[in-house]
């Protein structure tokens, strides 16, 4: 019952005498495993016996015994799905039908497979695309309906009997759907391949020829052309004649039209295979080719470069760049069309020949002002010398040169004078348009390049000017050498380094910051009284009476300058101490008595100490000692001591008398 068995395998397999056949096969028995398998050659059903007759190539039974002569045929399958077979070697008489007799526990089936074995290896088959065009990649396919694991083969491509360089891709298929060997070759045919024979050769593993297939290539291509020119080198002089001929070496399909092109542009009314140019001019120099078309497209010949030779044309000079800045580089180019190219150039600067300059370009790496002027050139080739033009002008721009600042005043200049300066220069390109002055000040510029300084300052030491065009050039600073009275006169204490104490040796210095001229005289004064004429004022032993306001004067030929008043302070210990009593030195008991410690001290007394007639210090430390109410027993002699940072001083004794009040006397 066919519904119980499902088989898949190729319908027909191909091989040749001595090769092998591999039969991929799968099956499914729906009612259980395979119990018996017989491979028949050309089986025929015998109705009488209800069995198949025919040559048994392979038999497998429940006991698993296989006839020993059947090793040529192998069943590579199993009991439930694989029915693959191999016959190795295969013989011519194996052609026909193979019958696979399958039996399970309850079902039987005969599956038929066709086997076609030829006497000699059959040829592969080459497949080509419907149209092949030059330079378009195509794939050539060589197919052979054979593949067997036990018999390796190879397919090789040949062009006109020579192995092709391109790499072919070979693939094999041994599946239940198909059995084949295929070789694919990717190939870009050129027009020269048209009509050539391509072969696919079947070879065994050792490269021995087995069979082949051949095809002739039909490569469609544009016309292939050759151009010939007279004269052959295509070099002529103006007025000569030139002939060009176009020849078609190949065209598939046949050509239809002819035309000529110069520098890629079609020449009108030139539609024959010959181009005649009479009395050529230099404008006819260029690249010529012929173009012939067919259904594929236009084909062009190689280009012929026609050179019409002529003497150099009138020359012009191009300057890169003018105006040029001094120090920059400049290049001059002599422009003169000529064929052949000029072999020699002569350069002129301001009408004079520039020696050693024979090239098309003149390069000056560092331009100087003297390079300015007219540059002209003349070009020369084998046909003659060109006309030399008037040339090109090089303008060299540079900052103002040799700038100087000049003082117009008579010398010397005194502080407060009006000073006039001018800014001079030697040359400039472009012209000077402005001037700058250093240092900046609120000064007048009455005219271009002139500076007026009203009431010149003592400190206007140097002035520099710059003359400016596109750049500024500074002159070296010029010294005004302004003369002035001594400046910044001040009194400075040289010794002692610390504060002045009574008895110290003291030196005062009269300082000034500057004076022009340098020669000076000094004067010291205190309270309008002249003390000395040296730069220093000295005290061997200073006393408090020397304290006061001091000034010094410094004068030169221009004038004199006084210092600010300087206060001389002398420090001394408390002196001239005395005790004063208020309301007096006799006080009635019960009243108030105030004792004051008076002194002269610098700095002032910072600390007071009081003592009684027993030299006993009292617990009071202020300048005033207040006794309230005063008692009779307060009577006695008192003294005080004053202390400052310099030292101590003491007063003489002062006696306080406290007398009894009338009340006390009355009680007695």
């Amino acid at each position: 019952d066919s519904s119980k068995w499902v088989f898949e395998h190729p319908e027909t397999l191909y091989a040749w005498e001595g090769a092998c056949v591999w039969i991929p096969c799968t099956y499914r028995a729906l009612d259980g495993d395979l119990e018996s398998f017989i491979l028949f050659h050309n089986p025929e059903y015998n109705k009488n016996t209800s069995k198949f007759d025919g040559t048994r190539l392979y038999e497998s039974t429940k006991d698993g015994k296989v006839p020993s002569e059947q090793k040529r045929v192998q069943f590579l399958g199993d009991k439930n799905k694989n029915c693959t077979l191999s016959i190795h070697p295969v013989h011519l008489n194996d052609s026909g039908q193979l019958g696979l007799r399958m039996e399970s526990k309850t079902e039987k089936w005969m599956e038929r497979i066709h086997l076609n074995v030829s006497e000699r290896p059959f040829p592969p088959h080459i497949q080509l695309p419907p149209e092949i065009q030059e330079s378009q990649e195509v794939t050539l396919t060589c197919l052979l309906n054979f593949s067997c694991y036990g018999y390796p083969i190879q397919l090789q491509w040949l062009l006109e009997g020579v192995p092709m360089r391109q790499a072919a891709v070979t693939s094999t298929s041994l599946t239940i759907k198909s059995v084949f060997t295929r070789s694919e070759l990717k190939f870009s045919p050129q027009w020269s391949h048209h009509g050539k024979i391509v072969t696919c050769q079947l070879q065994d593993a050792d490269g021995k020829f087995l069979s082949n297939d051949t095809v002739q290539l039909n490569v469609k291509h544009t016309p292939k052309l050759e151009i010939k020119v007279t004269p052959s080198d295509a070099i002529v002089r103006e007025g000569d004649s030139v002939t060009m001929t176009c020849e078609v070496s190949s065209s598939n399909p046949e050509y239809t039209t002819v035309s000529w092109l110069k520098d890629g542009t079609s020449l009108k009314k030139q539609n024959t295979f010959t181009l005649n140019l009479r009395e050529v001019t230099k404008d006819q120099s260029g690249k010529y080719c012929c173009q012939v078309s067919n259904d594929v497209g236009p084909g062009r010949s190689e280009e012929v470069f026609l050179q019409v030779q002529y003497a150099p044309e009138p020359s012009t000079v191009q300057i890169l760049h003018s105006p040029a800045v001094e120090g920059s580089q400049v290049e001059f180019l002599c422009m003169s069309l000529a064929n052949p190219l000029p072999t020699n150039y002569t350069w002129y600067h301001n009408g004079k020949e520039m020696q050693g300059r024979t090239e098309e370009k003149v390069h000056i790496p560092k331009i100087l002002p003297w390079h300015a002027g007219t540059y002209s050139c003349v070009a020369e080739n084998i046909l003659g010398t060109g006309q030399r033009g008037p040339g090109a002008e090089l303008d060299v721009q540079y900052p103002p040169k040799k700038v100087t600042t000049v003082i117009q005043n008579p010398m010397p200049i005194r502080e407060g004078d009006t000073v006039t300066l001018s800014c001079n220069y030697n040359s400039s390109n472009p012209s000077v348009t402005r001037y700058e002055w250093k240092p900046h000040g609120a000064w007048e510029e009455p005219s271009l390049g002139v500076l007026k300084i009203q009431n010149v300052g003592w400190d206007n030491t140097t002035i520099a000017c710059a003359a400016c065009n596109s750049w500024c050039s500074w002159a070296s600073p010029v010294a005004l050498n302004v003369q002035y009275a001594p400046r910044d006169v001040r009194v400075r204490k040289i010794k002692p380094l610390s504060e002045i104490h009574s008895g110290n040796s003291v030196s005062l210095q009269c300082d000034f910051s500057s004076s022009h001229p340098k020669e000076v005289q000094f004067f010291w004064e205190k309270n309008g009284r002249l003390l000395g004429k040296e730069s220093q004022l000295n005290f061997d032993s200073i006393s408090p009476e020397d304290a006061g306001s001091y000034s010094c004067w410094v004068n030169n030929s221009i004038g004199q300058t006084a210092s600010k008043a300087w206060t001389l302070e002398v420090l001394y210990a408390p002196r001239r101490l005395r005790v004063s009593m208020s309301p007096g030195d006799q006080v009635m008991e019960g009243k108030s008595a105030t004792l004051t410690c008076e002194s002269d001290a610098n700095p002032p007394v910072s600390h007071y100490t009081w003592f009684d007639w027993n030299n006993q210090s009292l617990p009071y430390h202020s300048q005033k000692l207040r006794l309230e109410p005063v008692k009779v027993q307060h009577s006695g002699a008192y003294w005080c001591q004053g202390t400052n940072s310099v030292g101590k001083g003491r007063s003489p004794l002062s006696t306080l008398t406290v007398y009894y009040s009338p009340e006390t006397i009355g009680r007695r």
Partner: antibody, heavy 118, light 116 residues
Framework: EVQLVESGGGFVKPGGSLKLSCAAS????????MNWFRQAPEKGLEWVAY????????YYADTVKGRFTISRDNAENTLFLQMTSLRSNDTAMYYC???????????WGQGTSLTVSS | QLVLTQSSSASFSLGASAKLTCTLS???????IEWYQQQPLKPPKYVME???????STGDGIPDRFSGSSSGADRYLSISNIQSEDEAIYIC?????????????FGGGTKVTVLG
């Protein structure tokens, strides 16, 4: 409008000197090379001298070399021709001419007449 | 030596076309030349510059009737629809700087007469 006005011509004895001037207007004088041409009575034109824009290049015809001096003042837009050691064959109409392009003598003055005679 | 050759005179009918020739010395056939017009008692007037390839540029105020062309060493001045005011001497000139010397050479001039 381009204008070139020559002046300074006149009568002079052989061996004498004279200075011709040409006042230019209507164009940037310093951008052009300038020439002096002359034309003797009933004769053809003759180039005399050339001066470049910036006075860098100066040329003279062989017939006047060493006797004539061409100069210009770009600030004043004026061209000069100082003539010394004058000869009778220097007698001519003298033209001040602007040069443009290659050698295009594109503007000519009306001319000033010089007669050298004893 | 740089030489310009012109025919001395030519006559043309009013309204006709005139073509004047100026021939350069053979070794100077690539040179640019200039054409000038000189009327009696007047200074020369610049007409045009003509190059070897026939291209030309006319001076200010020159009518379109004037054109230039070239062939080999010949330079041409053409006047179409010639007018009586075109009657003048036409002189060609050429400049060159040879070595360290400038030269400006004139042709002999062609005297043009307009008839009718």
């Amino acid at each position: 409008e381009v204008q070139l006005v020559e002046s300074g011509g006149g009568f002079v004895k052989p061996g004498g000197s004279l200075k011709l001037s040409c006042a230019a207007s209507g164009f940037t004088f310093s951008d052009y090379g300038m020439n002096w041409f002359r034309q003797a009575p009933e004769k053809g034109l003759e180039w005399v001298a050339y001066i470049s824009r910036g006075s860098h290049t100066i040329y003279y015809a062989d017939t006047v070399k060493g006797r004539f001096t061409i100069s210009r003042d770009n600030a004043e837009n004026t061209l000069f021709l100082q003539m010394t050691s004058l000869r009778s064959n220097d007698t001519a109409m003298y033209y001040c001419v602007r040069m443009a392009g290659y050698y295009a003598m594109d503007y000519w003055g009306q001319g000033t007449s010089l007669t050298v005679s004893s | 030596q740089l030489v310009l050759t012109q025919s001395s005179s030519a006559s043309f009918s009013l309204g006709a076309s005139a073509k004047l020739t100026c021939t350069l010395s053979s070794q100077h056939s690539s040179y640019i030349i200039e054409w000038y017009q000189q009327q009696p008692l007047k200074p020369p007037k610049y007409v045009m510059e003509v190059k070897k390839d026939g291209s030309h540029s006319t001076g200010d105020g020159i009518p379109d009737r004037f054109s230039g062309s070239s062939s080999g060493a010949d330079r041409y001045l053409s006047i179409s629809n010639i007018q009586s005011e075109d009657e003048a001497i036409y002189i060609c000139g050429v400049g060159d700087t040879i070595k360290e010397q400038f030269v400006y050479v004139f042709g002999g001039g062609t005297k043009v007469t307009v008839l009718g």
